[in-house]
């Protein structure tokens, strides 16, 4: 009878993560008596995957009944495959011996490759907000995929971006890989409602790419424009001055009125109106009792937006045209300063 050969018919097997891998092995003879063992890798550091003789291998099942002497099919199934299972598997026949079984013949090996889906891309923007016309960086990360080949694209509101750099790690062979990409985006005043999208395509996704998004509302700061105007006189000796705070984002805003450099009133924007582009408008007004002033009054609307240095706009109020009321020491009144305006 010819000497036993161990046949592993599959040079490679490709399995999706979570599925079961079947590793085929047959012997050409029933002689010699002895166990079959499966190993991952070769040489002294090889890892025992299955031992017919002894041990507990919960993920491994045999295709046929290996308990019987007349069995020559030593194929195994490994369940719940993960990328860490990738490698070359060897089916090895041992001869019954004393004091130990002796390795008799090995199969040529079967390379197990694992297809693993990338994790959902996570997009993160800059730690601090930036204003329009500035360039900001967004990063996109996805992990745990195999094989290494992967495609990553960036979009802003559906338009593909070109200014980005992508790395896949590690560079060499690995059980699974990670991708890291950084895109540069130029902000505009209209970007409050904009989205940046990172799209990852991989063989495991069957043409249905994964997307991660970042809202530019988390990144952008649109500074307000200020306009101070004097309204028609409401009553004798009273002037209504308004400060229009327009096109700002985010909403966090504090306004201070100054009369000739002295703080008259401070308030926080609450009842704001939202523009179509996502920015906000707000108006504050001040009733000035002109009879309390002998000279012209410099009214200043000072706005601190989102923790940034204050911006201001001033208005010179002429009091010479108005007769002064004696005994009045009230310079200004705060009545209905949060008037709602719709644009």
């Amino acid at each position: 009878e010819e000497e036993l050969q161990v046949i592993q018919p599959d040079k490679s097997v490709l399995v999706a993560a979570g599925e079961t891998a079947t590793l085929r092995c047959t012997a050409t003879s029933l002689i010699p008596v002895g166990p079959i063992q499966w190993f991952r890798g070769a040489g002294p550091g090889r890892e025992l995957i299955y031992n017919q003789k002894e041990g507990h291998f919960p993920r491994v099942t045999t295709v046929s009944d290996l308990t019987k002497r007349n069995n020559m099919d030593f194929s195994i199934r490994i369940g719940n495959i993960t990328p860490a299972d990738a490698g070359t598997y060897y089916c090895v026949k041992f001869r019954k011996g004393s004091p130990d079984d002796v390795e008799f013949k090995s199969g040529a090996g079967t390379e197990l490759s694992v297809r693993a889906k990338p994790s959902a891309p996570v997009v993160s923007g800059p730690a601090a907000r930036a204003t329009p016309q500035h360039t900001v960086s967004f990063t996109c990360e996805s992990h745990g995929f195999s094989p290494r080949d992967i495609t990553l694209k960036w979009f802003k509101n559906g338009n593909e971006l070109s200014d980005f750099q992508t790395n896949v790690d590690p560079v060499g062979e690995s059980v699974s890989y990670s991708i890291h990409s950084t895109a540069k985006v130029v902000l505009t005043r209209e970007d409050v409602h904009s989205q940046v999208i990172c799209e990852v395509a991989h063989v495991t996704l069957q043409g249905d790419p994964l997307r991660g998004t970042a809202n530019l509302s988390e990144t952008i700061r649109v500074p307000p424009t200020l306009e101070v105007t004097q309204q028609p006189v409401r009553a004798e000796n009273q002037v209504n001055v308004t400060c229009q705070v327009r096109k700002f984002y985010p909403q966090r805003l504090q306004l201070t009125w100054l009369e000739n450099g002295n703080v008259s009133r401070t308030e926080t924007a609450s009842t704001v109106t939202e523009n179509k582009d996502g920015t906000y408008n707000w108006m504050s007004w001040l009733l000035v009792n002109v009879s309390a002033h002998r000279d012209d009054v410099k009214l200043t609307c000072q706005v601190e937006h989102d923790g940034q240095p204050a911006v201001s706009k001033s208005h010179d109020l002429k009091v010479s045209a108005h007769p002064k009321e004696q005994g009045s020491n009230t310079a200004a009144e705060n009545t209905g300063s949060n008037e709602r305006n719709i644009y």
Partner: antibody, heavy 118, light 107 residues
Framework: EVQLVESGGGLVQPGGSLRLSCAAS????????MHWVRQPTGKGLEWVST???????YFPGSVKGRFTISRENAKNSLYLQMNSLRAGDTAVYYC????????????WGQGTMVTVSS | DIQMTQSPSSLSASVGDRVTITCRAS??????LAWFQQKPGKAPKSLIY???SLQSGVPSKFSGSGSGTDFTLTISSLQPEDFATYYC?????????FGQGTKLEIK
Amino acid sequence: EVQLVESGGGLVQPGGSLRLSCAASGFTFSSFDMHWVRQPTGKGLEWVSTIGIAGDTYFPGSVKGRFTISRENAKNSLYLQMNSLRAGDTAVYYCARGGNWDDALDIWGQGTMVTVSS
Amino acid sequence: DIQMTQSPSSLSASVGDRVTITCRASQDINNYLAWFQQKPGKAPKSLIYTASSLQSGVPSKFSGSGSGTDFTLTISSLQPEDFATYYCQQYNTYPYTFGQGTKLEIK
């Protein structure tokens, strides 16, 4: 059903010969090692002989040179030729299959009695 | 030749008891050890092979353990049909050898 049936036992004088047979059924006979085991009345078990799939044979020192084991795969039959029999060979002789991957004995026949006496 | 020594030679136990029989080899037998049950006038029946593998069709109340030279057969809960003689056998090295047997009797 896997079955082994021994035959050929009987009374024989010391120095005589006897040929035991074992008829196998219910399995592919040629794919298994086969064994003979004996048991003197009221005593323990003693391995007597093995024949491998390829025809290789094995014996303990107590029977070597006196016993021969053979197989006829076409007839699904196992044989034990016993020569120069002694009183100490008196026992029930069992045919057994090395049915497990490691050649452990898994199936036994019912046995046949061999008595060596004058 | 490898000597196989069983202990005890006989054992009295009651139905429901857990019993353990030991078998010692005179040298390392690489776990190639089998256990058999034999009732009077019957052929031996295979219970365990390769020290701990349960033969097909054998109830799980029988279990084998051990390695190297020391092995045990355990019957977890004795039933009337379990009272018999039990043999161990090494089949690592020719000549294959058996233990002298342990007779398990009803107390």
